[in-house]
């Protein structure tokens, strides 16, 4: 038996209510309101991890402030995890890093001259200045130290909630410092740091702070060089004036570590390499190093994004007199996000934000029920993740639909085939004082003992108004309940399968006709609730023509209101 009715409905079924567990992030500083804007970079190359940047996904922080859309900074955040840059060599002082939670537009600049011969590590250390060059307001959840005028960040952290615990050697008291470990020559690096304090009348005070950075200088042959960066942003510049032997080239490493939950974005400001020189970029911090780019892709303006909170850049140059070439890259941290949740088949998903704290809400098309969480929250982590698996929309095997006003019931698997050995019961209950009209969108049962019964009542013993075993054809006009219930049964045997059924229902008031429906068309009605005397005129969408039934129907018979003709169907021309 394979019978198909001419129309398909589009009503809304009442959903299965589920409670949403809301996750709340820790309070964070206010974030300026802003709209969505795209940043694209030139040239545009269709490469792995080279995307236009959607810096804000939707307007976070609008109206309510949306604290939950911002990543929370723990009061004692863990330092970024140690590097495991296999196969690249492990560097010193990577076990303890200052932490931050938000990128800022601070810029790292060119090296400066050493200012002091004194430092905490060795008498021979050279200490370039790390100067603050621009005032910057803290971003959301930004761990920025607030220093008063004249204060200097020292190796002993001030007692503030944001201060990370020092677990290893290094300048943990100097937040956001680009640390330089130069084996071969002293390299000065100027970075930036800002602090801002607000007085009672909300005036902003900008403070310039001088921070001493120590550089270890050792002479080593053949002259590898490496730098570690742990700030939210900085500059990666090709080494110059290295006092390395003249007969070897350079093999330099730039390691960048940002706060977990952020990725590293590297922008090529300038690059001019000589033939044979290589620059490679890898994402670290995952199970395996992730190759991101090499010199062939590193064109000016290109942006490389590591989806992990650690990255490494390796520069291998030629020996003099040919080399080395030059480059100037700028890196900054960017907030990692959850992947866009998969839209369920026969459903949809609405996302407020893909960043930690953002949420995704799922709902199903009429006739389908959600299996799984209706509401997911993006959680902050080294790689942010949704707090539950994406749900799926399933055509449930039965159920109770109370206050059924308009909607659909479909067999499990629809529009795919149903399973064997099913017995599904649906109870439809119209609102008090109303009856139900049931329309057959599709009924396709296997030729064996599969069976669909629709009963005029609320139980398995109520007399049927449709039984696929006994009825010769599907009624185009559908079925009417005498009361407020329909009881639908689908049973399948152990062999054979077909698409099953899709039934559309609508409730209507006593003394009225049910609301008409025509797929691929429209209708106009003389009155909105279809009492006796109402006339309805049908029309079809472009490319379709009216067939069977009548263009105009009327609700007749005050004792038992019904349409005087069947609804027409719109067929493709």
């Amino acid at each position: 038996l394979s019978l198909e009715a001419p129309t398909v409905g589009k009503g809304q079924a009442p959903g299965i209510e589920e409670t949403d567990g809301e996750l709340t992030a820790a309070p964070t500083p206010e974030q300026p309101e802003r709209g969505v804007h795209f940043v694209t970079t030139a040239p545009t190359l269709k490469l792995l991890n080279h995307h236009p940047l959607l810096e804000e996904f939707l307007q976070e922080g609008l109206e309510k402030g949306d604290e939950e859309l911002r990543p929370a900074l723990p009061f004692q955040p863990d330092p970024p995890a140690p590097f495991t840059p296999s196969p690249l060599p492990r560097l010193a002082n990577q076990d303890s890093r200052p932490v931050f939670t938000s990128p800022t537009p601070a810029m790292a600049a060119v090296p400066t001259q050493p200012q002091s011969k004194e430092g905490p590590w060795s008498p021979e250390s050279e200490s370039p200045m790390l100067r603050i060059t621009a005032p910057l307001p803290p971003g959301p959840s930004m761990a920025v130290p607030t220093l008063g005028p004249g204060e200097i960040a020292s190796t002993t952290p001030p007692s503030r909630a944001w201060t990370p615990t020092q677990e290893g050697p290094g300048d943990m008291g100097r937040p956001w410092v680009a640390e330089v470990v130069s084996q071969g020559a002293g390299i000065g690096i100027q970075g930036t740091i800002t602090s801002s304090t607000a007085s009672g009348d909300d005036e902003e005070t900008t403070t310039t702070t001088t921070i001493i950075t120590t550089t270890i200088t050792t002479v080593q042959t053949p002259g590898p060089c490496s730098w570690n960066f742990s700030g939210p942003e900085g500059s990666l510049d090709s080494p110059t004036d290295l006092s390395s032997p003249t007969d070897v080239g350079l093999d330099c490493f730039f390691y960048i570590s940002v706060y977990p939950g952020y990725g590293v974005e590297i922008k090529v400001q300038n690059i001019s390499l000589r033939e044979g020189e290589t620059v490679t970029v890898e994402g670290l911090g995952g199970p395996d190093p992730l190759p991101l780019a090499n010199q062939s892709f590193l064109l000016r303006g290109q942006v490389i994004r590591s989806p992990t909170h650690q990255a490494a850049l390796r520069f291998q140059s030629l020996p003099p007199p040919a080399g080395p070439g030059t480059f100037h890259f700028h890196y900054q941290a960017y907030l990692l996000s959850c992947h866009f949740p998969r839209r369920p088949a026969y459903g949809d998903v609405t996302v407020t934000s893909l960043h930690p704290g953002g949420s995704a809400r799922f709902h199903c098309a009429t006739g389908y029920q959600l299996k799984g969480a209706r509401h997911l929250t993006c959680l902050n982590a080294t790689q942010p993740f949704w707090d539950s698996k994406e749900p799926v929309c399933i055509a449930a095997c039965g159920g109770v639909i109370r206050n059924a006003t308009t909607g659909r019931i479909v067999s499990p698997g629809f529009p795919g085939n149903y399973s064997n050995n099913l017995t599904c019961h649906w109870l439809l209950e119209a609102p008090e004082g109303q009856r139900l009209h049931l329309h057959f969108e599709k009924v396709s049962l296997a030729e064996d003992d599969d069976r669909l019964i629709i009963r005029n009542g609320d139980n398995v013993e109520a007399p049927p108004v449709y039984d696929s075993y006994e009825v010769e054809y599907l009624p185009i006009e559908g079925l009417l309940s005498s009361g407020k219930h329909f009881f639908v049964e689908l049973s399948t045997d152990s062999s054979g399968a077909a698409a099953g059924m899709a039934l559309r229902y609508e409730a209507f008031q006593q003394g009225h006709c049910y609301e008409p429906f025509v797929k691929y068309g429209n209708f106009s009605s003389s009155t909105p609730t279809y009492p006796v005397g109402t006339t309805v005129e049908f029309s079809c969408d472009p490319g379709y023509t009216l067939e069977q039934g009548s263009i105009i129907i009327e609700c007749v018979d005050p004792h038992d209101p019904q349409w005087n003709e069947t609804e027409p169907a719109c067929r493709a021309v």
Partner: nanobody, 124 residues
């Protein structure tokens, strides 16, 4: 041509029993509904019982549940209604019907073919 012919009606005392029959000819379908209806003088016709030719499922109006039994002998192509514990309100003309349309099986909707009826009288 489908024909339905009822027989077995008559008069009976309240509490008595009666069996009415309906011989079906020309109806070759293995599926569809067969039903019994009755009409008392001055009243509308009402469904009494129905049976599915393929499923054998049986349905009864509430007023006769436990007293009447519908059955179908497919070999003889005959429909029966066994009536026990008859009451005066069971009096009326009993009609046999057959059909395979959708609709409440205890209403006339599904039925296309009808017999002429047989009279049943229950006196107190």
């Amino acid at each position: 041509d489908v024909q339905l012919v009822e027989s077995g009606g008559g008069s009976v005392q309240a509490g008595g029993s009666l069996r009415v029959s309906c011989a079906v000819s020309g109806y070759t379908k293995s599926s569809g509904w067969m039903g019994w209806f009755r009409q008392a003088p001055g009243k509308e016709r009402e469904g009494v019982a129905a049976i599915g030719r393929r499923s054998g499922d049986r349905y009864y109006v509430d007023s006769v549940k436990g007293r009447f039994t519908i059955s179908l002998d497919s070999t003889k192509n005959t429909l029966y209604l066994q009536m026990n514990d008859l009451k005066p309100e069971d009096t009326g003309t009993y009609y046999c019907a057959a059909g395979g349309r959708a609709g409440n099986v205890l209403t006339s909707q599904p039925y296309r073919y009808w017999g002429q009826g047989t009279q049943v009288t229950v006196s107190s």
